[in-house]
Amino acid sequence: ILLRAVTGFSGDGRAIWSKNPNFTPVNESQLFLYDTFPKNFFWGIGTGALQVEGSWKKDGKGPSIWDHFIHTHLKNVSSTNGSSDSYIFLEKDLSALDFIGVSFYQFSISWPRLFPDGIVTVANAKGLQYYSTLLDALVLRNIEPIVTLYHWDLPLALQEKYGGWKNDTIIDIFNDYATYCFQMFGDRVKYWITIHNPYLVAWHGYGTGMHAPGEKGNLAAVYTVGHNLIKAHSKVWHNYNTHFRPHQKGWLSITLGSHWIEPNRSENTMDIFKCQQSMVSVLGWFANPIHGDGDYPEGMRKKLFSVLPIFSEAEKHEMRGTADFFAFSFGPNNFKPLNTMAKMGQNVSLNLREALNWIKLEYNNPRILIAENGWFTDSRVKTEDTTAIYMMKNFLSQVLQAIRLDEIRVFGYTAWSLLDGFEWQDAYTIRRGLFYVDFNSKQKERKPKSSAHYYKQIIRENGFSL
């Protein structure tokens, strides 16, 4: 095993930074391992509804906090109406999926497209029809849907009426929405994600103000939002586990995102401690209650005593173990801009392999789905995205090394993203798609980039052949 726990750090992620060369079975400078992934490895690709659907007020869809935020906070962006128009060009998305040959497609449901004001009453028929058609088409193609219930597009009405995720009333409302989705789509969906990267929802939505709803500076609100997101996830997991799993036989998790960090001085225990704090304050914040002991990490409880809410003993018991696998996001959103508080004066790193090893050590070697991975290119780059290929090759090599050399139980990989689209605070200034879309065109053709061809080959060969 590459990264072995050393004395004093047993079962603790700090061991990652205390490398003993005697325990390293592979030269760290060896960038690529020419080998295949396990048989039946789950290859997929993903999108977020707000990023690609467009049609932000078409066919009865209600506004989301991001639609509002775009109009009030983001300069030079009229709306997501341009985008890739997946709502209109569903068939083109399906063709793109066919081209790559993925085993699964991860997409999110736009809550306000189903329920314009967020409250579960009669669903918006056109919205229901869109997702139902998409699911039927995926099943027909033997492409497994992985469905995210919340990828940041909260119905604006819930923000205005309740204050959004700051108000614990939203927990039950989210559970009602999830129940509806399980009822309507659960026969065709075996993998559910409750919330995509709650860290960014809380930190950038309520701390830096860089994400919707754009509130900033209130640390108590940041941690209250995080608390409510965790409780909402847990409630939905228990709901699914009790009422839907017995007959739908699916799995449910939450996608947690993180950066990776390296100590300034690898032999310095204080720098190592700071790296541990850094990971704990971002990934551990959500992973510890869900994948760990049901509570916030002890360091966070000490350091943030005045702003971090508490879980009662009953709640700790309720939070613990509310994920059927570890869904992990590792991409630019957790790196740029990185919370300087989380950086702790250390050096950020794109070492996905080590991040996976940290998860293994901290959370008892869970089954892991890479639920989002990839990088970005400048918006001027069209189909020749060589940087994206380099990054993909690097990341995939790290995942393969983690599986083959470190015995980490990664069972699937989600390339991000299927299409160029709206990239949150970066709007349309960067591109993350494996398919190029000219946002100014009428037909929004999906043109495969070099990275799409490359990923197609990786999937076909199930890894790297010599």
Epitope: A220, K303, F305, S306
Partner: antibody, heavy 123, light 110 residues
Framework: QIQLLESGPGLVKPSETLSLTCTVS??????????WSWIRQPPGKGLEWIGF???????NYNPSLKSRVTISIDTSKNQFSLKLNSVTAADTAVYYC???????????????WGQGTTVTVSS | QSVLTQPPSVSAAPGQKVTISCSGS????????VAWYQQLPGTAPKLLIY???KRPSGIPDRFSGSKSGTSATLGITGLQTGDEADYYC???????????FGGGTKLTVL
């Protein structure tokens, strides 16, 4: 060695505003591990927390005093201050400024105290 | 009325052992960390125990702290006359969003 020193009038008239300043020496009020606090002790009674302020300006106050209290910080002077409005005889006490500490590895509580200053509310 | 409950007084002879209890609830002691303070007559309080059971440098190991559930205990062994003081427990209360103290316990060394 960090030291805290309270300063301000020892006598305040009822209904007026009590104002105290704490000067920090041997350390900085800009550290992220500390909450700069005010605590008081009425004659013959126990300790009562008034509130604290973080270097960024964030504050927490005792709910029973919240409507009358303002704590501010001046990082350039390495000082923090207390204002308590509409005082009555019940506000007569020894007022301590203090450093409340909590880090990633340890919860310290109030680890450094000033010597205290007696404030009497009387006409 | 203090949020944390301490006995008003305890006493013991020199050389003996004494314990002072501090009782709270899940919103304070139960889910947070406890500190203990010693206030000698006419002086400012001094930190005696932090993080439930740790001693700052300079505090003799005759002083110890522990926590169980929603209660904390300060122990003093080998009592000395110089230990005569008021002792306070303190912690954060998550429901009140406030620092809370016990009412104080007067230790008399007989």
């Amino acid at each position: 060695q960090i030291q805290l020193l309270e300063s301000g009038p020892g006598l305040v008239k009822p209904s007026e505003t009590l104002s105290l300043t704490c000067t920090v020496s041997g350390g900085s009020v800009s550290s992220g591990d500390y909450y700069w606090s005010w605590i008081r002790q009425p004659p013959g009674k126990g300790l009562e927390w008034i509130g604290f302020i973080y270097y960024s300006g964030g504050t927490n106050y005792n709910p029973s005093l919240k409507s009358r209290v303002t704590i501010s910080i001046d990082t350039s002077k390495n000082q923090f201050s207390l204002k308590l409005n509409s005082v009555t005889a019940a506000d007569t006490a020894v007022y301590y400024c203090a450093r409340y500490s909590s880090t990633w590895d340890y919860y310290y509580g109030v680890d450094v105290w000033g010597q205290g200053t007696t404030v009497t509310v009387s006409s | 009325q203090s949020v944390l409950t301490q006995p008003p007084s305890v006493s013991a002879a020199p050389g003996q052992k004494v314990t002072i209890s501090c009782s709270g609830s899940s919103s304070n002691i139960g889910n947070n960390y406890v500190a203990w303070y010693q206030q000698l007559p006419g002086t400012a309080p001094k930190l005696l125990i932090y993080d439930n059971d740790k001693r700052p440098s300079g505090i003799p190991d005759r002083f110890s702290g522990s926590k169980s559930g929603t209660s904390a205990t300060l122990g003093i062994t080998g009592l000395q006359t110089g230990d005569e003081a008021d002792y306070y427990c303190g912690t954060w209360d998550s429901s009140l969003s406030a620092v809370v103290f016990g009412g104080g316990t007067k230790l008399t060394v007989l």
